[in-house]
């Protein structure tokens, strides 16, 4: 995968008039790595581990970098001629990437009420638009404007895609991205499902990179995909990411089952666990309610391995 | 490619015990099962147990609880069966097999024959 | 323990022929079961996993079929090297248990 770093700003309108102060998100590596949410916003690092290797002067140009185009978003939101009653918001995404083969690649998006309505190469310069008339008509209004701004002109576009990449680059060089690995904790849980029968939920939980293998085995062979069901994997607010797996097997059966881990090269197997039962409300149906698993993590009995 | 080298043939006296070695190479060991068959002289084939070699969790026929132990050397890659209280019952061909993570005995071991004779 | 029938202790064909072997189950076991095969020299390898599905590098003159408790094992043009013995296999419930194995030989 490419080494990346992506600005993530956003601004709002309420029943026409610009709101002051902005959102700024920026991701280095998919990570989460400084967040601004006010005006005059300081950039903080996402996590002990950007701010154990980059000093305050990061924080501070970013935070300068981060409040001046806040200030140029708002203006543009301004223009935008179609503002009616209501709260609005104009997000601007900004991504630059270095390859294995030291290639790169920057672009530009916009989106108006999350709908993007227009996105630009900063290397070549290219702008391209959906196909939809109201996409368009933003496009063309938000161009013009941009034309009209002389600061938007052809060397502010190579600026922008060079000012990244030099930021991208200052990072990678200070270690902060250095391919680390962090591996996951595994835990197995099991919780009655129905007459005979119970459910197996294996999470991993604090790992980096995002890639992991999760998979319930029986006698060592991988279950097939349709009889398991699996969460996201989501990031867990500490610059790490977590995620599960479940699967519904008979009663007594359990020791032909692990939770089979791969991850960063590293692998793990985890038996399935016999404990005290307690009975409790899982947090995990509220952001996996997609999958199904409602009628299991409702409300379960989970024995703990002691 | 995946090869499991078990240890030569053994003539044992009864009452006594024998351990079989199973080597395995060409994968990494820890990520698989090691499973033991035992084949009878022109019989069929019975399953004895298997031992995970990450942790050690070992499932067994019941048949055969008391009388197989399976254990492993994570350092040679070597999964070992210990038979033990040998009787004439106990004379056969030893397998052990390994999977791919999709199938069940997979790969198997070229076997060792194991006499228990007086 | 789930009893596995192989009915056909053994069977005598031609090279080029289509043979078919079965297996029986003392009860349904939802396709979960494979087939190996035992060379004269006592060499082992899996043919065929989950019923239907082939172990990779196993000529595709093998194939495997049934459900519930009746499966098949079917050579379809014979070979020189197809002479060994065959065992079916659950693996459903525990203990896993193997057929008592159908010898192939030449006629």
């Known amino acids: 995968e490419p080494h990346s770093l992506r600005y993530n700003l956003t601004v709002l309108s309420g029943d026409g008039s610009v709101q002051s102060g902005f959102l700024a998100e920026v991701h280095l590596d998919g990570q989460p790595f400084l967040r601004c949410d006010r005006q005059k916003c300081r950039a903080k690092p996402q996590g002990q581990w950007a701010e154990d290797v980059l000093g305050n002067k990061t924080w501070d140009r970013e935070t300068r970098d981060l409040t001046g185009n806040g200030k140029d978003l708002r203006m543009t939101l301004a223009h935008i001629k179609d503002q009616k009653e209501g709260l609005h918001s104009l997000q601007e995404i900004r991504v630059c990437e270095i390859h294995e083969d030291n290639s790169t690649r920057s672009s530009q998006h916009f989106y108006y009420d999350g709908e993007l309505f227009l996105s630009q190469n900063l290397e070549t310069e290219e702008w391209t638009m959906p196909q939809s008339s109201r996409a368009q008509t933003l496009a063309m209004n938000v161009r013009n404007f941009l034309k009209e701004d002389a600061m938007k002109t052809k060397t502010h576009y190579h600026a922008m895609h060079a000012d990244c990449l030099q930021e991208l680059r200052r990072y990678l060089k200070s270690g902060v991205v250095l391919r680390r690995t962090v591996p996951p904790m595994v835990n197995v849980t099991r919780s009655e499902a129905s007459e005979g029968n119970i459910t197996v939920t294996c999470r991993a939980s604090g790992f980096y990179p995002w890639n992991i293998t999760l998979s319930w085995r029986q006698d060592g062979v991988s279950l097939s995909h349709d009889t398991q069901q699996w969460g996201d994997v989501l990031p867990d607010g500490n610059g790490t990411y977590q995620t599960w797996v479940a699967t519904r097997i008979c009663q007594g059966e359990e020791q032909r089952f692990t939770c089979y881990m791969e991850h960063s090269g590293n692998h793990s197997t985890h038996p399935v666990p016999s404990g005290k039962v307690l009975v409790l409300q899982s947090h995990w149906q509220h952001h996996h309610h997609h999958h199904g698993l409602n009628d299991i993590f409702e409300a379960q009995k989970i024995e703990w391995h002691e | 490619q995946v090869q499991l080298q078990q240890s030569g043939p053994e003539l044992v006296k009864p009452g006594a015990s024998v351990k079989v070695s199973c080597k395995a190479s060409g994968y990494a060991f820890t990520k698989y099962n090691i499973y033991w068959v035992k084949q009878s002289h022109g019989k069929s084939l019975e399953w004895i147990g298997y031992?995970?070699?990450?942790?050690?969790?070992?499932v067994y026929n019941q048949k055969f609880k008391g009388k197989a132990t399976l254990t492993v050397d994570k350092s040679s890659s070597t999964a070992y069966m210990h038979l033990n209280s040998l009787t004439s019952e106990d004379s056969a061909v030893y397998y052990c097999?390994?999977?791919?993570?999709?199938?069940?005995?997979?790969?198997w071991g070229q076997g060792t024959l194991v006499t228990v004779s007086a | 323990d789930i009893q596995m029938t192989q009915t056909t202790s053994s069977l005598s064909a031609s090279l080029g022929d289509r043979v078919t072997i079965t297996c029986s189950a003392g009860?349904?076991?939802?396709?979960?079961l494979n087939w190996y095969q035992q060379k004269p020299d006592g060499t082992v390898k899996l043919l065929i996993f989950y019923t239907s599905s082939l172990q990779s590098g196993v000529p595709s003159r093998f194939s495997g079929s049934g459900s519930g408790a009746d499966y098949s094992l079917t050579i379809s043009n014979l070979e020189p090297e197809d002479i060994a013995t065959y065992y079916c296999?659950?693996?459903?419930?525990?203990?896993?248990?193997f057929g008592a194995g159908t010898k192939l030989e030449l006629k």
């Open positions: 097999a390994t999977t791919d993570g999709y199938s069940l005995f997979t790969y």
């Open positions: 031992i995970d070699p990450y942790n050690g969790g070992t």
């Open positions: 009860q349904g076991i939802n396709n979960y």
């Open positions: 296999q659950q693996y459903s419930k525990l203990p896993l248990t």
